[in-house]
């Protein structure tokens, strides 16, 4: 393709300034918002190369990539319009190259501004500015090992870019992977550079190779899928926890109870009450207040701890972790013992609003 | 500016079926994949179906599995949903939706269109 | 399919309120969670993708994090025009499947 590098003018007119480079119709590069534009700088010998957008010096940054004679925007705006130059410098003399970028939708009048993923590589339709493949969002690939229960879906990604578009394919331990080679097949998105397997079972264990390559070169990536076969049991509860505790009056104390479960378990918090003198109901079931379950701001790692602050001898009794999954329900419950503070009466306080369960 | 635009709903009896189109403008259509979601009255959001840019992907909710069709014209700029053998379960407020490129979140949506299954 | 929850399935603030709504998958999607409004009549409009990342025009109050099955968006102080319904959609397996809805009311 042509060069379109500055070349020495020597037909300047004496009025207009002296300059050394006339350009000499650069070429534009056309990019929508959000997608990632690459360019070559198309110097010769360019050892130290400096770039520069509408004269100024340009540095790298989170989304500006300057490699070698690579120039890479990722998740392009209308902002990154402009005329750039790369300079490639040497011992004798420099040499400065031009080009245009223009960021806009070629059908949408430029307002389609909010496609800030940067996933897709991007190269203008009408340049030469070929490239063997190259992974664009390396961050989607770093978890290498996936070990995944049985009957979930698993999804491997490999975001690749190049010119011209890289096609990808997929191995299974080094071989096609066929769909036929898995009851139910895969789902391969190509425009998300993904494959998908639903309802995983022990013999979709493996390697997975991703191998993403154009007429300029070839990548791959693997993956190992180790598939953990469901145990049907409910949760199961940590031996001697919650632990029967004591505290005096206006202490602090904490209830600790660690679940261990396959299918996902809600976990509560209860305490056993007495109603009108009695512990059980007429039917024989016993009074219960739920003090803590998962909700809006609870984690499964806060919920496996229940703090008591300021303890009254109202908190006295029977704690009970409960923890329930689609098999079943386990619970295990512990003591808490509240000893009167040296020289203060025993507190009274109202008695709280009751569940029944 | 990127607009999308429903049309093809109205009442149809149990049984029977109906086409939905979705006229996009204001974007390359072809380099976007395109989505279906619907709205029962209400009620929440149910994804219904996805198509490729380039068509040659497609995959349906279980519900809607064997009786709706998903695909599109890229030379008419337009997303097509065919839904056969409809049941009352299927009467919500359609929508077609733009996939951001790579992250299939919703970027876009049409104003939607009203499918309402009643004998 | 992959399910997902959301807690609480309404609630109620005030303006300048910080509002946290949260979403479960019931298996690990990794970071493929998005985050939608919707108002009465309206088609629902994107606020957060991938998790975390802002969509363009969205107001810096609305954030979104988490990761594998638990995610959260926060509406840092709640204004006026946020009072709506917000859904939550994970893409991370071929059906793209939303959370039932959160509604966020005027107390």
């Known amino acids: 393709r042509p060069s379109f590098s500055l070349v020495e003018d020597t037909t300047l007119e004496p009025e207009e300034p002296p300059t050394k480079y006339q350009i000499s119709q650069p070429e534009v590069y056309v990019a929508a918002p959000g997608e990632s534009l690459e360019v070559r700088c198309l110097l010769k010998d360019a050892a130290v190369i400096s770039w520069t957008k509408d004269g100024v010096h340009l540095g790298p940054n989170n989304r500006t990539v300057l490699i070698g004679e690579y120039l890479q925007i990722k998740g392009a705006t209308p902002r990154d319009s402009g005329l750039y130059a790369c300079t490639a410098s040497r011992t004798v003399d420099s040499e400065t190259w031009y080009f245009m970028v223009n960021v806009t939708d070629a059908i949408s009048s430029g307002d389609d501004e909010d496609d800030t993923d940067g996933a897709e590589d991007f190269v203008s339709e009408n340049s030469n500015n070929k490239r063997a493949p190259y992974w664009t969002n390396t961050e989607k690939m770093e978890k290498r090992l996936h070990a995944v229960p049985a009957a979930n879906t698993v999804k491997f990604r490999c975001p690749a870019g190049g010119n011209p578009m890289p096609t990808m394919r997929w191995l299974k331990n080094g071989k096609e992977f066929k769909q036929e080679h898995r009851i139910g097949g895969y789902k391969v998105r190509n425009q998300h550079w993904s494959l998908i397997m639903e309802s995983v079972v022990p013999s979709d264990k493996g390697n997975y190779t991703c191998v993403v390559e154009n007429e300029y070169g070839s990548i791959n990536h693997t993956y190992h899928l180790d598939v953990v076969e469901r145990s049907p049991h409910r949760p199961i509860l940590q031996a001697g926890l919650p632990a029967n505790a004591s505290t005096v009056v206006g202490g602090d104390v904490e209830f600790v109870c660690k679940v261990y479960s396959d299918a996902q378990p809600h976990i509560q918090w209860i305490k056993h009450v007495e109603k009108n003198g009695s512990k059980y109901g007429p039917d024989g079931l016993p009074y219960l207040k739920v003090l803590k379950a998962a909700g809006v701001n609870t984690t499964d790692k806060e919920i496996e701890v229940l703090y008591i602050r300021n303890v009254t001898f109202e908190d006295a009794g029977e704690y009970t972790c409960l923890a329930g999954n689609s098999i079943g329900i386990s619970f295990h419950s512990a003591w808490l013992t509240v000893l009167p503070a040296p020289g203060r009466e025993k507190e009274i306080t109202a008695s709280p609003d009751y569940l029944e369960i | 500016q990127v607009q999308l635009l429903e049309s093809g709903g109205g009442l149809v009896q149990p049984g029977g079926s109906l086409r939905l189109s979705c006229a996009a403008s204001?974007?390359?259509?072809?380099?976007?994949?395109m989505s279906w979601v619907r709205q029962a009255p209400g009620k929440g959001l149910e994804w219904v179906s996805v198509?490729?840019?380039?068509?040659?992907?497609?995959h349906y909710a279980d519900s809607v599995k064997g009786r709706f069709t998903i695909s599109r014209d890229n030379s008419k700029n337009t997303l097509y949903l065919q839904m056969n053998s409809l049941r009352a379960e299927d009467t919500a407020v359609y929508y077609c939706?733009?996939?951001?490129?790579?992250?299939?979140?919703?970027?876009?949506w049409g104003q939607g269109t009203l499918v309402t299954v009643s004998s | 399919d992959i399910q997902m929850t959301q807690s609480p399935s309404s609630l109620s603030a005030s303006v300048g309120d910080r509002v946290t709504i949260t979403c479960r998958a019931s298996?690990?999607?990794?970071?493929?969670l998005n985050w939608y409004q919707q108002k009465p009549g309206k088609a629902p409009k994107l606020l957060i993708y991938?998790?975390?990342n802002l969509q363009s025009g969205v107001p810096s109050r609305f954030s979104g994090s988490g990761s594998g099955t638990d995610f959260t968006l926060t509406i840092s102080s709640l204004q006026p025009e946020d009072f709506a319904v917000y859904y939550c959609?994970?893409?991370?397996?071929?059906?793209?499947?939303f959370g039932q809805g959160t509604k966020v009311e005027i107390k």
């Open positions: 991938d998790a975390s």
């Open positions: 198509i490729e840019g380039d068509g040659s992907y497609t």
């Open positions: 959609q994970q893409h991370y397996s071929p059906s793209h499947t």
């Open positions: 298996q690990d999607i990794s970071s493929d």
């Open positions: 939706a733009r996939e951001k490129t790579y992250s299939s979140a919703f970027d876009y």
């Open positions: 204001g974007f390359t259509f072809s380099d976007y994949a």
